[in-house]
């Protein structure tokens, strides 16, 4: 059997890995598979990043493609730059490097075309369509820092195995990303088990020093302790386990309260039980069992809307009756007519108009019935002022090459790290958009298309947008990486109307970000499945106080004091919440709980294929989601009001492939 | 240049096997991936899979699972292929054909060059 | 399987007339489309590839155009040498390749 052919391998540097699987997969596939794992199709920048590559792919056979990180759209030829009108899926244009088969051509491009890498010679990239399916693909991985491979030692039964958090699992590798486990077996018998982790006085380093494979008590096999070990005075060993675990009957496991905690919703460690239960933000603990929560009716508050209330459980929403429009504010109704706004009809358009076959987008539309379930690591808010429209994506990249954002960065605060703090959730107010992106965000379901951003202009300084990036947010919390957490302070909130808080399910990993309640992340990934109305569905609608039932688990809705995307019930005729293109229930929109400054909405599409692993986990493993109600008719189509100025400036990222009122799903952008 | 050439016995008899050799020349033969297509008379060409020389990957039509094998001897630059429980319906011209890699910077899976077909009669 | 339905069937048409043949794929294959000549008694030969691009050696009358599920092939000047029937492929790996029916092109 071909060697070349047999196993994924990797080359990694001190920030950032290449890894090589030998899998036949389309590019979409494979870009895909690069990011379930966390990482990106390669994308080598400079020659010094090609020289790994290179070194990683060896000598294989003429016959062997490999796909790497680019892209072109139909008639997107530019042949005078340097990638021809290529993008890297990163979403930018930037390079040091090329290697081209052939010189450019002059012609028409009138077809999407993505590159693959020959296995052979010089490794020339190849232009060709990207639904064909090639010998394998080129990922990409980058980190904050990685550790050196240990030293073999005397004592040693053979070489180290590590684990990378990519999931590749060899003895031949230079450098550990951060993350990644030593697997030392020692003659004696005992092994020992190292991580690579974050150092308190900066850096990251391995979890233990050596040597691993001498001496007696903490030393082999880490005592035997599951997390901590102790060398007492007499020489003798105790174990301890980091906070919120308890030690097991054993003596030597740790186990997670939680594990086997009844709550209903969230726990947390600690109390006299060993934990102890809380409820997502618009539920309250049971009268009769505070194991469970029920909802609370904010509808039954004075106020609460200026007409009408409807109560989901989990959140409310506001009304107006007919011949008046919800203003920005949520709550409030003016006469119809009085707050125009720029529907996103021509823009969708103009957005999708690459001169493909649009009745045959028609069809493929309505064979891709499951809807928009996830958008990976994006998380939208409309400004107070509509700004020249940007979207920022930060891809895990070598830090000697981040790729240019398209708006100057600020740089501050310092870095933080995911602080332990008090359990309780908040809104707050924002007044200009947030991004947050995932270095390692998760793969889209099979039946969805995933979206990759293109270069957008830059923003003004009044409309920068900030960037959370976060890292690996499936390791345990000890050893998170630093996060890093840059934001602008909202513009002084005096002339705008009060927000109300709405209820939704807590939806991010407390490291993917400081401003997230605490969490402890098993080393798997969380499925959340985020619910959403059912479009058949009307909602009760009662005058102001009005007792209303629940009509929906875990409605998700927002409101802030940034201006809103509607959100209005498709079986509603009689009522309008405002004049822009409409939402419908499905599509709504939820927040995380935040004890930073800033409310970040998500654009969540509902109707998930089952197990589909969300981007957007629960603050706590052991929160339960609600299931999604299935829905058999078309997915609602959806209409993005996008408050730019200028439609030609806006981004394709979302508005092309999911949002836009005629958009339907191909594969011309990922 | 390159050439590919199909040789086999031009009857065999029903639940019999049919063997088929196709002999390659003019390229390094562990390069390029060969095709199995055939053609009944008066219609048109029916794939039947594919093998790559470099690493004896083999893909199948579904249709023809269970009854082809497909072989290579790189030594000799030959590609075999084996269909069993032949019937009067898999009489046809049998033709091996090359799978292109890359022309003029694109990389590309036609196939590019072809045998000169073998016509197989299957009768008793 | 992917289908990959061709018309016309058959045509007939004077030297120095365009020929227009087309193809429909009954899912999205890209540009992983192959148009293919074959003369009475002798095998198949590649005239475009990759949906749009000209084999090497192939004369500039013939080209094909198209992405995604439809598909054209175009002979801009008919020639006595181009009796033949056509065929359309397409080659994407899933699930396997696949045929169109072949169009029979004759002069009138």
């Known amino acids: 059997q071909d060697p070349w052919a047999a196993e994924p391998r990797a080359a990694c540097g001190p920030s950032s890995c290449y890894a090589l699987f030998p899998r036949r997969r389309t590019f979409l596939e494979a870009w895909r598979a690069c990011r379930e794992l966390g990482g990106d199709l390669a994308t080598p920048r400079t020659p010094e990043e090609a020289q790994r590559v290179d070194s990683l792919v060896g000598a294989g056979p003429a016959s062997r493609l490999l796909w790497i990180g680019l892209q072109r759209q139909a008639r997107q030829c530019q042949l005078q730059r340097p990638l021809r009108g290529f993008t890297w899926t990163t979403g930018d244009q930037d390079t040091a490097f090329t290697n081209w088969a052939q010189p450019a051509s002059g012609g028409p491009c009138p077809a999407q075309r993505c590159v693959a890498l020959e296995a052979s010679g010089e490794h020339r990239w190849l232009e060709g369509s990207c639904t064909l399916a090639v010998d394998g693909y080129l990922c990409q991985f980058g980190f904050e820092g990685a550790c050196p491979a240990l030293q073999d030692e005397a004592g040693q039964a053979g070489p180290a195995v590590y684990t990378t958090p990519f999931h590749l699992v060899s003895t031949e590798f230079e450098w550990l990303p951060f993350g990644s486990v030593a697997a030392v077996q020692c003659q004696a018998g005992r092994g020992a088990s190292l991580l690579c982790v974050k150092q308190p006085e900066g850096g990251v380093g391995w979890s233990r020093a050596g040597p691993l494979c001498l001496g007696t008590g903490c030393s082999p096999d880490n005592g035997g302790c599951e997390h901590e070990c102790v060398e007492e005075v007499d020489g003798h060993v105790s174990c301890r386990c980091t906070e919120g675990f308890r030690l097991a009957a054993d003596g030597r496991s740790c186990e997670d309260p939680c594990a086997q905690a009844p709550c209903e919703q969230q726990c947390e460690p600690g109390g006299p039980q060993g934990y102890s239960c809380h409820c997502r933000l618009g539920f309250r603990p049971a009268e009769d069992d505070p194991h469970r929560c029920v909802d609370t009716d904010e509808c039954q508050i004075a106020g609460v809307c200026q007409q009408m209330c409807v109560n989901y459980v989990g959140g409310f929403e506001c009304y107006c009756s007919e011949g008046h429009e919800l203003e920005a504010d949520g709550i409030s109704c003016s006469p119809a007519g009085a707050m125009g706004a720029q529907a996103s009809q021509d823009l969708g358009d103009e957005l999708l108009d690459d001169g493909e076959d649009e009745e045959d987008e028609d069809e493929a539309w309505k064979a891709f019935n499951g809807g928009w379930t996830e958008m990976p690591g994006i998380l939208w808010m409309e400004p107070t002022q509509p700004p020249d429209f940007a979207l920022a994506y930060r891809p895990s990249f070598p830090e000697d090459r981040e790729p240019q954002i398209p708006y100057p960065e600020p740089t501050w605060p310092p870095p933080l790290s995911a602080p332990r703090v008090p359990y309780h959730s908040s809104v707050l107010s924002v007044t200009r958009p947030v991004v947050v992106s995932a270095t390692h965000p998760t793969l889209p379901s099979a039946h969805q298309p995933p979206v990759i951003p293109a270069t957008h202009p830059a923003l003004s300084r009044d409309h920068q947008i900030p960037v959370i990036a976060a890292n690996y947010p499936d390791l345990p919390s000890a050893y998170q990486p630093g996060i890093l957490s840059v934001s602008h302070s909202a513009q002084p909130p005096a002339h705008q109307p009060p927000m109300i808080s709405t209820k939704y399910p807590e939806l991010f990993p407390a490291h993917q970000s400081p401003m997230f309640p605490d969490t402890r992340v098993a080393g798997t990934q969380t499925t959340t499945h985020l619910p959403g109305i059912p479009p058949n569905h009307a909602p009760l609608v009662t005058t102001l106080g009005a007792q209303l039932p629940p009509q929906a688990p875990d409605a998700l809705v927002l409101r802030t004091q940034a201006t809103q995307l509607p959100i209005i019930p498709t079986a509603q005729p009689s009522l309008t919440t405002t004049s822009r293109s409409p939402v419908s229930p499905a599509h709504q929109i939820s927040v995380p709980a935040a004890t930073q400054p800033a409310a970040l909405p998500t654009l969540l599409p509902s109707q998930s294929p089952t197990n589909q692993t969300s981007p957007i986990s629960p603050t706590h493993p052991h929160s339960k989601a609600p299931q999604i109600p299935r829905e058999d008719g078309p997915s609602p189509k959806l209409a993005l009001w996008l408050p730019s100025p200028a439609p030609t400036a806006a981004p394709t990222a979302l508005g092309e492939a999911g949002l836009a009122e005629h958009s339907q799903r191909d594969d011309r952008w990922l | 240049q390159v050439q590919l050439q199909e040789s086999g016995p031009g009857l065999v008899r029903p639940s019999q096997t049919l063997s088929l050799t196709c002999t390659a020349s003019g390229y390094t033969f562990t390069d390029y991936v060969i095709h199995w297509v055939r053609q009944p008379p008066g219609r048109g060409l029916e794939w039947i899979g594919y093998?790559?020389?470099?690493?004896?990957?083999?893909t199948y039509n579904q249709k023809f699972k269970g009854r082809v094998t497909m072989l290579v001897d790189t030594s000799s630059n030959t590609a075999y292929l084996r269909l069993s429980s032949v019937t009067a319906e898999d009489t046809a011209v049998y033709y091996c054909a090359r799978r292109g890699n890359s022309y003029d910077g694109y990389f590309d899976y036609s196939m590019d060059y072809w045998g000169q077909g073998s016509l197989v009669t299957v009768s008793s | 399987d992917i289908q990959m339905t061709q018309s016309p069937s058959s045509l007939s048409a004077s030297v120095g007339d365009r020929v227009t043949i087309t193809c429909r794929a009954s899912q999205n294959v890209g540009t992983a489309v192959a148009w293919l000549q074959q003369t009475p008694g002798k095998a198949p030969k590649l005239l475009i590839y990759s949906a749009s691009n000209r084999y090497t050696g192939v004369p500039s009358r013939f080209s094909g155009s198209g992405s995604g599920t439809d598909f054209t092939f175009t002979i801009s000047s008919l020639q006595p040498e181009d009796i033949a029937t056509y065929y359309c492929?397409?080659?994407?790996?899933?699930?396997?390749?696949?045929f169109g029916q072949g169009t029979k092109v004759q002069i009138k």
């Open positions: 093998i790559n020389p470099y690493d004896d990957d083999t």
């Open positions: 492929q397409q080659y994407t790996n899933y699930p396997m390749y696949t």
